[in-house]
Each structure stands twice: as structure tokens, then as C-alpha cells.
Interface confidence: medium
């Protein structure tokens, strides 16, 4: 079992190194910013031009492109729940410095947890996404 575990670790490590998780990070950041914007926006203020697409629509289109790319990358981890967890942890760690305040961090984490399902993939049943808990072993 140990030999298999070692090979599994190496395979996961090389998958993680090959994967480009940046689209996932961009998709999630845009998603939580879009949510914040829609909550923060005054519903009674008239739009500048009723015929031009709002910046939210434009950003939404970009985000769906990021999501598609992101899902393609995550698809590589579909058959390895442990490695899928590693990928999600990596996304969390990469973005943790850019998240402002506890609320944004919780929101990002919530969206990150839902990401595999959004991609039609199996989410790892258990996965520690706390970044405060110190550095992670990278095998």
C-alpha cells in the first residue's frame, strides 16, 4: 500500500504541476466580486445607457470562459479525490493574500467548495480549505 501511495503522490504532484489553475482563480475572484457588486449596487440608480451591456454582463461572459477552462483543468483530477482536494487547496492558498477580510475569504471558500459540482465533477467528500493552519506538505 505504501508503494502505491508513493506512486499516487507522485502522480498527483505531476498532475498539479501540469495543471493551470489560474482560470479557476480568475473565475472565482470574478464571481465573488460580481456578487459583492450586485449586493453593493443601488437598485434605484438609473443605468447610464439602457442599451449598452452592463459591465456585469461583460464580466460574466469572461467569467464563463474562465469557468470552462477551469473545468477542463479540474477534469484531470476527477478520478483522484485526494488530488482534487490538493488542487482546491492550491487555489485557496494562491488567492488567500488577495482576499480582503474574513467575509470575502468565507465567500471564496464557499464558491471554491461548489466548484467541482459546477463543473459536473465529483467533489472530494472532505477537504480542509483553511489556510491559517500552516504550510502544507507537497510530498
Amino acid at each position: 500500500r505504501q508503494q502505491w501511495e508513493l506512486q499516487g503522490d507522485r502522480r498527483c504532484q505531476s498532475q498539479l504541476e501540469r495543471a493551470n489553475l489560474r482560470p479557476c482563480e480568475q473565475h472565482l475572484m470574478q464571481k465573488i466580486q460580481r456578487d459583492e457588486d450586485s449586493y453593493g449596487r443601488d437598485p434605484y440608480s438609473p443605468s447610464q445607457d439602457p442599451y449598452s451591456p452592463s459591465p456585469y454582463d461583460r464580466r460574466g461572459a469572461g467569467s464563463s470562459q474562465h469557468q470552462e477552462r477551469c473545468c477542463n483543468e479540474l477534469n484531470e483530477f476527477e478520478n483522484n479525490q485526494r488530488c482534487m482536494c490538493e488542487a482546491l487547496q492550491q487555489i485557496m492558498e494562491n488567492q488567500s493574500d488577495r482576499l480582503q477580510g474574513r467575509q470575502q475569504e468565507q465567500q471564496f471558500k464557499r464558491e471554491l467548495r461548489n466548484l467541482p459540482q459546477q463543473c459536473g465533477l465529483r467533489a472530494p467528500q472532505r477537504c480542509d480549505l483553511e489556510v491559517e493552519s500552516g504550510g502544507r506538505d507537497r510530498y
Epitope: 485526494r82 472532505r126 480542509d128 483553511e130 491559517e132 493552519s133 502544507r136
Partner: antibody, heavy 123, light 111 residues
Framework: QVQLVQSGGGLVQPGGSLRLSCAAS????????MTWVRQAPGKGLEWVSN????????DYLDSVRGRFTISRDNSKNTLYLQMNSLRAEDTAVYYC????????????????WGQGTLVTVSS | QSVLTQPPSVSAAPGQKVTISCSGT????????VSWYQQLPGTAPKLLIY???KRPSGIPDRFSGSKSGTSATLGITGLQTGDEADYYC???????????FGTGTKLTVLG
């Protein structure tokens, strides 16, 4: 307040069967992951089995898989452990525990425990 | 069944601080949340810490948890004689699809 009351323990011969019950009250049973944990005399804690809120997913300790079956009846607020082909090494105090795992990413922690019931397998 | 490794025993005088370590691997502590339990003689275990660092209501802040990489630590400050008990860590192991408990640590409060 939360209560888990266990029953069904006792003395059984090797190869025999026993069914443990754990009656829950004071919380919404159908929303909690449930678990069985055992402790052999003078030894540490050993997890035995988990069952999801709706009973759809079950996990077992390797050494009991195929012999033990965890189940729940949410209408009766009761958790069960059917133990077949019992061995001397299954002798232990068995605890049922309610697991506060509300979403699937949280940890496996057991925040409410039954009083424990002794199962002795001996000829 | 593989285990999470804890020191068999620790001891300190009342009022002092102790830490109990729990060492695992990438498939358990490295990926999953850790919880800690206290078991007084002849009683059922009691949850002290969950999700690495959180305390259930009613658990004093003398008890704290932390996690780094594949190890977790329980800290107890201001030791009291009532803290004499066995302490266990626990987490999920992704490879075994099982919950693992630590080997257990007996805490003795001296004097």
C-alpha cells in the same frame, strides 16, 4: 438537551450476532451524520462505521466490513449496528456518536456521545 | 489500519501548559480537518476541538488546536487536576475511506 441512549450489548459466542441500538432525542436526528466508535478494554478509541444523514452512504473499518452493517431509521430517531460473525477481537465498549458534519467538507467530529454498551465475545 | 501517532504520556504541574502532538500523513491530516477528544476514566469521550482550531460551546479557551502540514497539536494552558484524562486526535483518511483516531495520550497533572 441532546441524548443518545444505547442498548443491545451483552455476552455472545464467537460466530454469533448482536444488534446495537442508539435512540436519539433533543436534536433533529435526520440532519446528523451518525457514527459507531469502539474501545477494547484498556485500549484506545477505534472508529467502526459512519452513515450519512439520509442513509445513502456508509463507511466501515476494514476489519468489520462484510460482517457489520450500520443503518438508521429517521422516523424512529434510531441508529443501529448489526454485528454478525463476531470474533473475540470485537470485544469492546461500543459508543454511538452524533456527528456535527453539516456540509460534506467539514471535519468528521463527534459532538454528542452515547453512554456506551459493552459487547463481550467469548465462549 | 494505520494510525495517527501521539506521545503515550505527558505530564506537568497545575497551572502549567502542555502540548500534545498528533502526527499523520498527506492522506489524513494533510488533507482533512482534525478534531480532539478528552476521555475521563470510565466515561464517554468529549469533543474539545473540531475543524483544527474551533472549540464547541462550553469548552474553555484554555484548550486550543492548531495544524501544520501533516501534524496537529492540542494545547492546554492553566492545567487543572480535572484535566487528568486520555486525549485523542482524529481525522478522515482519504486513502482508507475511514476515520482514524490517534494512539491516545495520557495526561498526568503532577502534585
Amino acid at each position: 438537551q441532546v441524548q443518545l441512549v444505547q442498548s443491545g450489548g451483552g455476552l455472545v459466542q464467537p460466530g454469533g450476532s448482536l444488534r446495537l441500538s442508539c435512540a436519539a432525542s433533543g436534536f433533529k436526528f435526520s440532519t446528523f451524520y451518525m457514527t459507531w466508535v469502539r474501545q477494547a478494554p484498556g485500549k484506545g478509541l477505534e472508529w467502526v462505521s459512519n452513515i450519512k444523514q439520509d442513509g445513502s452512504e456508509k463507511d466501515y473499518l476494514d476489519s468489520v466490513r462484510g460482517r457489520f452493517t450500520i443503518s438508521r431509521d429517521n422516523s424512529k430517531n434510531t441508529l443501529y449496528l448489526q454485528m454478525n460473525s463476531l470474533r473475540a477481537e470485537d470485544t469492546a465498549v461500543y459508543y454511538c456518536a452524533a456527528n456535527g458534519l453539516q456540509d460534506s467538507y467539514s471535519g468528521d467530529f463527534f459532538d454528542h456521545w452515547g453512554q456506551g454498551t459493552l459487547v463481550t465475545v467469548s465462549s | 489500519q494505520s494510525v495517527l501517532t501521539q506521545p503515550p504520556s505527558v505530564s506537568a504541574a497545575p497551572g502549567q501548559k502542555v502540548t500534545i502532538s498528533c502526527s499523520g500523513t498527506g492522506s489524513n491530516i494533510g488533507h482533512n480537518y482534525v478534531s480532539w477528544y478528552q476521555q475521563l476514566p470510565g466515561t464517554a469521550p468529549k469533543l474539545l476541538i473540531y475543524d483544527n482550531t474551533k472549540r464547541p460551546s462550553g469548552i474553555p479557551d484554555r484548550f486550543s488546536g492548531s495544524k501544520s502540514g501533516t501534524s496537529a497539536t492540542l494545547g492546554i494552558t492553566g492545567l487543572q487536576t480535572g484535566d487528568e484524562a486520555d486525549y485523542y486526535c482524529a481525522t478522515w483518511d482519504a486513502d482508507l475511506s475511514a476515520v482514524l483516531f490517534g494512539t491516545g495520550t495520557k495526561l498526568t497533572v503532577l502534585g
